[in-house]
Interface confidence: medium
């Protein structure tokens, strides 16, 4: 199948595609944490990995992280400085209530991460997203079958009776 044909198939169901995109962006908005370390809380982050998402590279990638060099002491105002090895850049892991490149901004209202409300909202949005995907797939398949049935010919015309084996030559 050509790329054009795939695109034609994907772009055909406009309403399902719109719902699909809406669901995806809602999910993305909730799960937009930039750095999610895979180190155990309280464990040394000298050498572990993290899931990173940057503005330059919107894809989530798994990278190695270590502590920043000593000359970066004090760089992060309210947080821990970590060095993203694969991306060759420093990053501040802010303390609760702080944000910004160097953890310089303070939140007046602080919610504990992964509160019950947050988990519930995430679960609801994931369910909505899955319903959207299933619904979109169903309506797309129905549309595609209807379009195919209206076509005057199959992709390959049957022109003779089937002869899988030939008679004596």
């Amino acid at each position: 199948m050509t790329a054009g044909r795939r695109m034609e198939m994907l772009c055909a169901g406009r309403v399902p595609a719109l719902l699909l995109c809406l669901g995806f962006h809602l999910l993305q908005a909730v799960l937009s944490t930039t750095v999610i370390p895979s180190c155990i809380p309280g464990e040394s982050s000298d050498n572990c990995t993290a899931l990173v998402q940057t503005e330059d590279n919107p894809r989530v990638a798994q990278v190695s992280i270590t502590k920043c060099s000593s000359d970066m002491n004090g760089y992060c105002l309210h947080g821990q400085c970590i060095y993203l090895v694969d991306m060759s850049q420093n990053y501040c892991r802010c303390e609760v209530g702080y944000t910004g490149v160097r953890c310089e901004h303070f939140f007046l209202t602080v919610h504990q991460p992964l509160s019950k409300e947050y988990v519930a909202l995430t679960v609801i949005l994931i369910i909505l997203f899955l319903i959207t995907v299933v619904g979109s797939t169903y309506y797309f398949c129905r549309w595609y079958r209807n379009r195919k049935s209206k076509e005057p010919k199959k992709e390959y015309e049957r022109v003779t009776s089937g002869d899988p084996e030939l008679p004596q030559v």
Partner: antibody
Framework: VEESGGRLVTPGTPLTLTCTVS????????MAWVRQAPGKGLEYIGF??????TYYATWAKGRFTISKSSSTTVDLKIITPTAEDTATYFC????????????????WGPGTLVTVSS | QVLTQTPSPVSAAVGGTVTINCQAS????????LAWYQQKPGQPPKLLIY???KLPSGVPSRFKGSGSGTQFTLTISDLECDDAATYYC????????????FGGGTEVVVK
């Protein structure tokens, strides 16, 4: 499978060749026409399917017409013969796979010679 | 769609082996809708191989077809005097309709 109707014709005079089959019903088989100029290779002209749909080689469109005149005969009409149409014309059954998609010609008739000359 | 046969002519001694190549300018339908025919002077073509490698009943196993897509080969082993003939490959294509193309033919001379 046997062809007939080949003869000497003058340029521009339409000529119809007939392919007669025995032992098979043309409502279940496709039949093709292939020609061979003296000392040259085989050249596919076109074929007629079991549903009477006709398919022609690009070069043959508008120059030939294939039709079923009965349940046992297939005709090839050379609309406006020229000297280049001088050849032996073969009729062959189109053999399909289990899906009915065509892939082979078998069996072939002995051929009929058409000479176009003034 | 063009089928190019090489070499032509080809000669070999009795008992020998000849190989004929057939190259398609674009992929054959289903990658294997290719047939080989043998034609002797004054006779219609005779089917030797269909679906690239299948042998119809009645054709000696000395004839072997191989290949897929755009490159195909007919190999005749244990050559006999009766094998002297012209060999043609024929491909099937689909492009909004069915099309057939024959190769230019390869003459086999048996010494």
């Amino acid at each position: 499978v046997e062809e007939s109707g080949g003869r000497l014709v003058t340029p521009g005079t339409p000529l119809t060749l007939t392919c007669t089959v025995s032992g098979i019903d043309l409502s279940t088989f496709a039949m093709a026409w292939v020609r061979q100029a003296p000392g040259k290779g085989l050249e596919y002209i076109g074929f007629i399917s079991l549903s009477d749909a006709t398919y022609y080689a690009t070069w043959a469109k508008g120059r030939f017409t294939i039709s079923k005149s009965s349940s046992t005969t297939v005709d090839l009409k050379i609309i406006t013969p020229t000297a280049e149409d001088t050849a032996t014309y073969f009729c062959a059954r189109v053999v399909g796979d289990s899906s009915g998609y065509p892939n082979t010609f078998h069996p072939w008739g002995p051929g009929t010679l058409v000479t176009v000359s003034s | 769609q063009v089928l190019t046969q090489t070499p032509s002519p080809v000669s070999a001694a009795v008992g020998g082996t000849v190989t004929i190549n057939c190259q398609a300018s674009q992929s054959i339908h289903n990658s294997d809708f290719l047939a080989w025919y043998q034609q002797k002077p004054g006779q219609p073509p005779k089917l030797l191989i269909y679906r690239a490698s299948k042998l119809p009943s009645g054709v000696p196993s000395r004839f072997k077809g191989s290949g897929s897509g755009t490159q195909f080969t007919l190999t005749i082993s244990d050559l006999e005097c009766d094998d002297a003939a012209t060999y043609y490959c024929q491909g099937t294509y689909y492009s909004g309709g069915w099309y057939f193309t024959f190769g230019g033919g390869t003459e086999v001379v048996v010494k």
